[in-house]
């Protein structure tokens, strides 16, 4: 006897006569001379249990065959698939008045699974079944089973189960297979929501609304719903679920992010590689851990690289004027990978004899534009005490400085108020200009106000407009500025320093480097 057969996923078989081992044992009425259970051989000489009747010689046949009780398993509509062979009445001798070529299909709902007798009046007719083809002996002779297949449905059903019955009215027929099934929309996952096996509705046009549940490691975005159609197909998916943070969709599931990857939010995005200077060591990371010495600010997105505090500002210049000090500096060489760099000024008042004995300047000192959070690289400090040593620290800070403050992030200068600095240098000359260098010379300030300790040359490309300058210090009154770019305009300033501090810068000297070497003697005017 053939074993279980494979049917579509949206069909649930309640009865399959071909899968029954041994005799079917259905109830026939009359017990003799009507339907008879007969073994036939299929093409592979495998026995198949069939029910046959061929009472074609007598009129007014009324032969009934009833199945065993069939549970409906909650189905409201069931389908009956009948595979049968019907013999052409013309192929049977002398039976033209009595032979028929149809049979009738009936059903009876019952909660009783052990009804022993067929009561015809209890049964409701489903349909009259006619063959699409009827066969003569010629058709059957080749041993290949030629079957008609008819499917009928019945519903709505309400009792625990039902019986089917076949009424023969004088045909020559073999029921080769009777299969009863209902349709369901099979368990499925759509938009990361799982929808359970759902039995179709009672009507052939009904839609059953089903709420889905989010798959593991996901959460609802919009309430997931689908409709189970009468044919067992899912229709109109609405809403969806999103994989939780640390998970991404793969084949309808939410899989944990692999090591080295992360996902910060419940979105439909995939896991992303950890940003620069960060790592993850576990699967399912929602963020990546910063490398040693690197940090993430509170308001940094998980997708941003980890950064570090900046290095110290460069080229700090001070200019003392009685009880005021002007400080100027350049941006740090390393910003730590961040754009949010700012500067804080720390003012310390130090003892004359012991510079290590310093204390905060206090609230009487004023800073322009401000003391902390400076975006520019200069500050004016006023209302200092006269004849006092001050140390000023310029701290470069960014969004992660607080996680790792270090002296390496600051530069300092010590000045004494109320000591006269040298006057400005009146004349700066370009003695020689080449493609890559300028030789400068200048005169001592008119009023040195003491021993000049050194001169400071500040220069920058003209079109940089002092945003990025360089400093060269020398004890002589001349210097060669090397490493310049050809055919580029540079601006030079020079000032002197004594023990009292720096004087003012000279007026700017503008020099353009050559393409061909030549000697130019400047007189303080712009040289080209």
């Amino acid at each position: 006897v053939t074993g279980s057969r494979v049917y579509p996923a949206n069909e649930v078989t309640l009865l399959d006569s071909r899968s029954v081992q041994g005799e079917l044992g259905w109830i026939a009425s009359p017990l003799e001379g009507g339907w008879e259970e007969v073994s036939i051989m299929d093409e592979k000489n495998t026995p198949i249990r069939t029910y046959q009747v061929c009472n074609v010689m007598e009129a007014s046949q009324n032969n009934w065959l009833r199945t065993d009780w069939i549970t409906r398993e909650g189905a409201q509509r069931v389908y009956i698939e009948i595979k049968f062979t019907l013999r052409d009445c013309n192929s049977l001798p002398g039976v033209m008045g009595t032979c028929k070529e149809t049979f009738n299909l009936y059903y009876y709902e019952s909660d009783n699974d052990k009804e022993r007798f067929i009561r015809e009046s209890q049964f409701g007719k489903i349909d009259t079944i006619a063959a699409d083809e009827s066969f003569t002996q010629v058709d059957i002779g080749d041993r290949i089973m030629k079957l008609n297949t008819e499917i009928r449905d019945v519903g709505p059903l309400s009792k625990k189960g039902f019986y089917l019955a076949f009424q023969d009215v004088g045909a020559c027929i073999a029921l080769v297979s009777v299969r009863v099934f209902y349709k369901k929309c099979p368990l499925t996952v759509r938009n990361l929501a799982q929808f359970p096996d759902t039995i179709t509705g009672a009507d052939t046009s009904s839609l059953v609304e089903v709420r889905g549940s989010c798959v593991n490691n996901s959460e609802e975005k919009d309430v997931p719903k689908m409709y189970c159609g009468a044919d067992g197909e899912w229709l109109v998916p609405i809403g969806n679920c999103l994989c939780n943070a640390g998970h991404e969709e793969q084949n309808g599931e939410c899989q944990a992010c692999k090591i080295g990857y992360y996902k910060a939010l419940s979105t439909d995005a995939s896991c992303a590689k950890c940003p620069p200077h960060s790592y993850s060591v576990w699967e399912g990371a929602t963020s990546c851990t910063c490398d040693r010495g690197f940090f993430r600010a509170d308001n940094d997105a998980a997708s941003m690289p980890c950064t570090r505090p900046p290095s110290a500002p460069l080229n700090l210049i001070s200019n003392v004027n009685e009880t005021s000090v002007n400080l100027e500096w350049s941006s740090p060489q390393n910003t730590g990978g961040r754009q949010d760099i700012s500067y804080n000024v720390v003012c310390k008042k130090c003892g004359a004899g012991d510079p290590s004995k310093c204390r905060p300047c206090g609230s009487g000192v004023h800073y322009t534009p401000q003391q902390n959070g400076l975006k520019t690289t200069r500050v004016s400090i006023t209302d200092l005490l006269a004849h006092t040593n001050y140390t000023f620290e310029i701290w470069a800070v960014n969004g992660v400085s607080k996680y790792n403050p270090s002296p390496d992030q600051s530069v300092s200068v010590t000045v004494t108020t109320n000591q006269a600095a040298p006057s400005s240098i009146a004349l700066v000359q370009a003695k020689e200009v080449t493609r890559y260098s300028v030789a400068l010379a200048w005169l001592e300030p008119d009023r040195p106000n003491g021993v000049i300790l050194e001169y400071e040359v500040k220069y920058y490309e003209k079109d940089q407009n002092e945003r990025s300058y360089r400093i060269v210090r020398t004890a002589a009154r001349n210097t060669d500025i090397k490493g310049l770019n050809p055919l580029t305009s540079y601006v030079f300033h020079v000032r002197a320093r004594t023990a009292a501090g720096y004087g003012d810068f000279s007026e700017p000297l503008e020099v353009t480097t050559n393409t061909v070497p030549s000697r130019i003697i400047g007189d303080g005017a712009n040289s080209t």
Epitope: I40, D42, V56, T85, P93, G94, Q137, I140, C172, I173
Partner: antibody, heavy 121, light 106 residues
Framework: QVQLLQSGAEVKKPGASVKVPCKAS????????MSWVRQAPGQGLEWMGW????????TYAQGFTGRFVFSLDTSVSTAYLQISSLKAEDTAVYYC??????????????WGQGTLVTVSS | EIVLTQSPATLSVSPGERATLSCRAS??????PAWYQQKPGQAPRLLIY???TWATGIPDRFSASGSGTDFTLTISRVEPEDFAVYYC????????FGQGTKVEIK
């Protein structure tokens, strides 16, 4: 159970007639055709023909027309084979057999025990 | 009239062996033959009809196949009670029997 009961052996002289009865039981007599089959001593089976028990319409095989007549008495569920002008070569066992029509083919599914008719002078 | 020829006339087999009986029609027939078994002193018994249907109570070691003019009855493993004469029979407008094959103990 379904049975076909035939009469005992008959000994007849050449030229005589014989009527062999076949009484059916255990099923509706008029629902199945009845066939007649002859088997001469030591020989194989020969199909003689059949009769539609519902209409009484007979069909005879080649070689069995004229002297052979199939008839019925449905009131007693009995089929008859009558052979007239018996010849020595008619000596044989005569079987009645119920015809089974099915979707997949026909056959004779229930047989009588046979009636031996001996024709001898 | 269609003539059915059975072969061999006698087939000697041992119990448990496979037996294959042939039935050849003189012309192509529209249907597969029925097969009968007859033991000495008994009426014939229907085995298989329409080439695909076992008669009531017939074990499935008996099977039939073929089409057109050549047909076969196969006994997969011969049992002691299977030794008998076997006839094929063609049905249609006129029915005819083959002359029979005797299956005897080897």
């Amino acid at each position: 159970q379904v049975q076909l009961l035939q009469s005992g052996a008959e000994v007849k002289k050449p030229g005589a007639s014989v009527k062999v009865p076949c009484k059916a039981s255990g099923y509706t007599f008029t629902s199945r055709a009845m066939s007649w089959v002859r088997q001469a001593p030591g020989q194989g089976l020969e199909w003689m023909g059949w009769i539609n028990t519902n209409t009484g319409n007979p069909t005879y095989a080649q070689g069995f027309t004229g002297r052979f007549v199939f008839s019925l008495d449905t009131s007693v569920s009995t089929a008859y084979l009558q052979i007239s002008s018996l010849k020595a070569e008619d000596t044989a066992v005569y079987y009645c057999a119920r015809v089974r029509f099915t979707v997949y083919g026909d056959g004779m599914d229930v047989w009588g025990q046979g009636t031996l008719v001996t024709v001898s002078s | 009239e269609i003539v059915l020829t059975q072969s061999p006339a006698t087939l000697s087999v041992s119990p448990g062996e496979r037996a294959t009986l042939s039935c050849r029609a003189s012309q192509s027939v529209s249907s597969n033959p029925a097969w009968y078994q007859q033991k000495p002193g008994q009426a014939p018994r229907l085995l298989i009809y329409g080439a695909s249907t076992w008669a009531t109570g017939i074990p499935d070691r008996f099977s039939a196949s073929g089409s057109g003019t050549d047909f076969t009855l196969t006994i997969s493993r011969v049992e002691p009670e299977d030794f008998a004469v076997y006839y094929c029979q063609q049905y249609g407008p006129s029915w005819t029997f083959g002359q029979g094959t005797k299956v005897e103990i080897k």
